[in-house]
Structures are given as structure tokens and as C-alpha cells.
């Protein structure tokens, strides 16, 4: 099995207020088993924002479909976007436990958001 | 108890379509994904189509991959396979399956329930 | 398609076992009994080793490397059929393997 790597690939991404964003992520093996989680900022702090295993998160959709065995890609659009979802957001992947344990994160895309168009 | 009604099968005619539907009770039908499998006489069993519970992500066989539609409604509890361009080589008995809270469509190890069947015959 | 043996036979109270091979890196298997021609399908294992509630505590599946395996303990007459695989292989298609007919001796 090759070492697991997260890969997003957007160093930063720039919206404008009310569109949606794209955040990229794709993982390069299967294992370990576990979900990916999606956070806003790092530390305690931090705010999830997408779990692949509970929701649901009424303004976030996946770009693939998450529960196929083979899928690999666990990008996600955030829809409505405002000035308070600006920061950066961390793809991770969990190994499955009780509880799951964070195993691996990806270096992060930083979202700006722009004024909306007038 | 879980029970998988499918309808819509019979004789049919070469290039024709049809619409084969299974109604799902007995469990949470919007969270679970749903495939339709099929076995033409003195055959195996073969992958036809899948779905995802939201329907968002359909899939399909490499035999049916252009004539085929897989849709569902999940407020009636029902996913509906429609085929196009019939062949001769389509018939087969149809059965719908759910998976059993992993994997999708196509995702045949996931499989935990199965209809009891609709026949379907292409013929002239 | 995925591999599985023609044919496996086996004496009342003894214990089959039925391989499957070629599933996608996922390595997941599900196992399904048929005991006749144009019967329904039943599944006896889901995702591995999960068995649906109905299913006799005698049927149990496992993986290993990239094979499942079915394993049937204290085999009865009732539990002859035909036995298919299920996964999907690596680009996401559903593969069945062509099915292992189990006799029951005697």
C-alpha cells in the first residue's frame, strides 16, 4: 500500500460574495480506512465545516460522490459565500476508531472573498 | 422488514423501451443507495445500473452504458430503470437491490437486499 | 469479472470454504446464494463480513490481501445453491463473479 497523501492542490482561491467556492482535494490511496473531514482555520479553533460521515451541511455538497469504494476525490463547493467564510480550509483524513483519529492533513487552500459585483 | 416491489416487466419488442420500477419499504430509503442487477435465462448474475441515495451520481454497465436511465424519487420511495433500443440479449429477470449503508452504485459488496424479480422478454 | 471456483462440494456438517478474486483495491465482497434458476437472489455477506439479520450465524466472510472468502461451517443439505461474488473493480463498475455451485454430499 503506498503512503496516503492529501492533495490540494489550490494554494488560494478567490470568490465573490453570494457565488460558490471550490475547494480541492484528492487523496492518492485507500488506506488507511477512515473519513475525510473538511475544517475552517487549524487548532482548537477550528470550525468544521464538511464530515463525511455526519450532516448534513446544508451549504456544502461534494463535488465526487464520497461514499464510492474507489472514490479518491473529496473536493467540495461551498455555496453563498460571505465575508465571514473567508480563511483557510483544511482537507483531512481520519482513521477510523472510536473515537476517529486524525491521521493526515492537506497544507491548506486559503479562501478570499471579493465584494459582490454591483 | 425490508421489501423491494419491482413492476414494469413483460414482453417487449426489439428497439422498443421500457420502464421497470421498484418501490423500497420497510427501511430509510433516501439513505441507502440502490442498484438493479440482472439474469438472462441459464446465466449469471450481471451489474446493470446504480444510483446514489440523493441521485445525484448515477452509474451504469458497459452493456446498457447510452440506452440506459436510472432515476429516483425519494419522497415516493422508488428508483426507475429505463431502457432504450431494446435487444434481444436484454431479456433477462430484473431485480432491484439496495445497499446496505456503504458504497453505491456499482458497489456490489455493499448489497444487503434484493427484490424478487420482474421478467422482462424482447421479442418479435 | 471477478474469479471464483466452478464448483465446491462438501459433506453434511463439514465446513466450505469459496474464494473470490479481482474485486477493485477496495478489496470488498459481497456474497450472494442462489438456490435455483430465476430465484431471487439472497445475500448471505455484505461489505466482507457483515451478515444480514436472517442469515444463520454458519455463513462468514473475511478478506485477505485482495481474496474473499465465503466460509460456510456445519454445512446442511438446505444450504445447497449457487454462489456468486460481488465487488467492483477499479474503475467503479459492478463485477459479479460467474457464480460456485455448492453440493451438498450424501
Known amino acids: 500500500e503506498e503512503e496516503l497523501q492529501i492533495i490540494q492542490p489550490d494554494k488560494s482561491v478567490s470568490v465573490a460574495a453570494g457565488e460558490s467556492a471550490i475547494l480541492h482535494c484528492t487523496i492518492t490511496s485507500l488506506f488507511p480506512v477512515g473519513p475525510i473531514q473538511w475544517f475552517r482555520g487549524a487548532g482548537p479553533a477550528r470550525v468544521l465545516i464538511y464530515n463525511q460521515r455526519q450532516g448534513p451541511f446544508p451549504r456544502v455538497t461534494t463535488v465526487s460522490e464520497t461514499t464510492k469504494r474507489e472514490n479518491m476525490d473529496f473536493s467540495i463547493s461551498i455555496s453563498n459565500i460571505t465575508p465571514a467564510d473567508a480563511g483557510t480550509y483544511y482537507c483531512i483524513k481520519f482513521r477510523k476508531g472510536s473515537p476517529d483519529t486524525e491521521f493526515k492533513s492537506g497544507a491548506g487552500t486559503e479562501l478570499s472573498v471579493r465584494a459582490k459585483p454591483s | 422488514a425490508v421489501t423491494l416491489d419491482e413492476s414494469g416487466g413483460g414482453l417487449q419488442t426489439p428497439g422498443g423501451a421500457l420502464s421497470l420500477v421498484c418501490k423500497g419499504s420497510?427501511?430509510?430509503?433516501?439513505?441507502?443507495?440502490m442498484n438493479w442487477v440482472r439474469q438472462a435465462p441459464g446465466k449469471g448474475l450481471e451489474w446493470v445500473a446504480g444510483?446514489?441515495?440523493?441521485?445525484?451520481?448515477?452509474y451504469y454497465g458497459a452493456a446498457v452504458q447510452g440506452r440506459a436511465t436510472i432515476s429516483r424519487d425519494n419522497g415516493q420511495s422508488t428508483v426507475r430503470l429505463q431502457l432504450n433500443n431494446l435487444r434481444a440479449e436484454d431479456t433477462a429477470t430484473y431485480y432491484c437491490?439496495?445497499?446496505?449503508?456503504?458504497?453505491?452504485?456499482?458497489?456490489?459488496?455493499?448489497?444487503?437486499?434484493w427484490g424478487h424479480g420482474t421478467e422482462v422478454i424482447v421479442s418479435s | 469479472a471477478l474469479t471464483q471456483p466452478a464448483s465446491v462440494s462438501a459433506n453434511p456438517g463439514e465446513t466450505v470454504e469459496i474464494t473470490c478474486s479481482g474485486g477493485g483495491s477496495n478489496n470488498a465482497y459481497g456474497w450472494f446464494q442462489q438456490k435455483s434458476p430465476g430465484s431471487a437472489p439472497l445475500t448471505v455477506i455484505y461489505d466482507n463480513g457483515k451478515r444480514p439479520s436472517d442469515i444463520p450465524s454458519r455463513f462468514s466472510g473475511s478478506k485477505s490481501d485482495s481474496t474473499g472468502t465465503l466460509t460456510i461451517t456445519r454445512v446442511q443439505a438446505e444450504d445447497e445453491a449457487v454462489y456468486y461474488c460481488?465487488?467492483?473493480?477499479?474503475?467503479?463498475?459492478?463485477?459479479f463473479g460467474a457464480g460456485t455451485t455448492l453440493t451438498v454430499l450424501g
Open positions: 420497510g427501511f430509510t430509503f433516501s439513505s441507502h443507495a
Open positions: 437491490t439496495k445497499n446496505g449503508g456503504c458504497g453505491s452504485g456499482g458497489d456490489l459488496d455493499c448489497i444487503d437486499a
Open positions: 460481488g465487488s467492483a473493480d477499479n474503475s467503479g463498475a459492478g463485477v
Open positions: 444510483i446514489s441515495s440523493d441521485g445525484r451520481f448515477t
